[in-house]
């Protein structure tokens, strides 16, 4: 690399992928293996991120950019830049410190992550329950009971809901 000749800071001419080497009279030296500098004028190169454990490499480290990780199947990313991996659960479950646990009766989760949420209360909107909720699915609200008066609708009102047993915790 050519020795830099900036009047202000000789390091300012060092491009990304190099560092300004004080041990060699501020010559721009290439970043050593497993390190990078993403901007010019750096006095050191940063150590490349290693994707260990259930982290897996999405993008290899280069002299000018850090490695990027994602998570192996069974886990998903959390945090900026996938700084953490968190385990997946099945639909109808939520993650706790005790692992994946079934949603309590009256709650559901339709994803592999996140928490169980209460079923929609149809009556708050003046509607009736058209399809009962499950651990995996929210209830489906139908027309209001008034809309179901004779001649007003062809929709048959649902049979009274049979309350299932409480989900095990």
């Amino acid at each position: 690399f050519e020795r830099t000749r900036s009047l202000q800071d000789p390091c300012s001419n060092c491009p990304a992928g190099t560092f300004c080497d004080n041990n060699r009279n501020q010559i721009c030296s290439p970043c050593p293996p497993n390190s990078f500098s993403s901007a010019g004028g750096q006095r050191t190169c940063d150590i490349c991120r290693q994707c260990k454990g259930v982290f897996r490499t999405r993008k290899e480290c280069s002299s000018t950019s850090n490695a990027e990780c994602d998570c192996t199947p069974g886990f998903h990313c959390l945090g900026a830049g996938c700084s953490m991996c968190e385990q997946d659960c099945k639909q109808g479950q939520e993650l706790t410190k005790k692992g994946c646990k079934d949603c309590c009766f009256g709650t559901f989760n339709d994803q592999k992550r996140g928490i169980c949420r209460p079923w929609t209360n149809c009556s708050l909107d003046g509607k009736s329950v058209l399809v009962n909720g499950t651990k995996e699915r929210d209830v489906v609200c139908g027309p209001s009971p008034a809309d179901l008066s004779p001649g007003a609708s062809s929709v048959t009102p649902p049979a009274p809901a049979r309350e299932p047993g409480h989900s095990p915790q």
């Epitope: 959390l78 945090g79 953490m84 968190e86 993650l95």
Partner: nanobody, 123 residues
Framework: EVQLVESGGGLVQPGGSLRLSCAAS????????MNWVRQAPGKEAEWVAN????????YYVDSVEGRFTISRDNAKNSLFLQMNSLRDEDTAVYYC????????????????WGQGTTVTVSS
């Protein structure tokens, strides 16, 4: 450098025992939840067990409950997994993982991982 290094894996017969260890360095070990996670060949990774900062709370996946015991020695910055009554289906790479800074507060992400140690259960 923040680091976790597992050891203790090997080949063992069904019904046998193994004790895995994880040496932690570069961070205040006693301040973090710690976990064991495993990945069997061709299968999704699976959380196995966790332990809180002082060792007073320990939780396990159902399939290992009563057979595996997680423990820690904060004075030696070490995490352990005692594995008894091993089965063929316990064959996997076992990883030690640190719980993230907000672990247990509706988030259970793990931010630091070891390279893993291989456990093979076979007759």
């Amino acid at each position: 450098e923040v680091q976790l290094v597992e050891s203790g894996g090997g080949l063992v017969q069904p019904g046998g025992s193994l004790r895995l260890s994880c040496a932690a360095s570069g961070f205040t070990f006693r301040s973090y939840w710690m976990n064991w996670v495993r990945q069997a060949p061709g299968k999704e990774a699976e959380w196995v067990a966790n332990i809180n900062q002082d060792g007073s709370e320990k939780y396990y996946v159902d399939s290992v409950e009563g057979r595996f015991t997680i423990s820690r020695d904060n004075a030696k910055n070490s995490l352990f997994l005692q594995m008894n009554s091993l089965r063929d289906e316990d064959t996997a790479v076992y990883y030690c993982a640190r719980g993230g800074p907000d672990y247990g507060d509706l988030h259970y992400g793990m931010d630091v991982w070891g390279q893993g140690t291989t456990v093979t259960v076979s007759s």
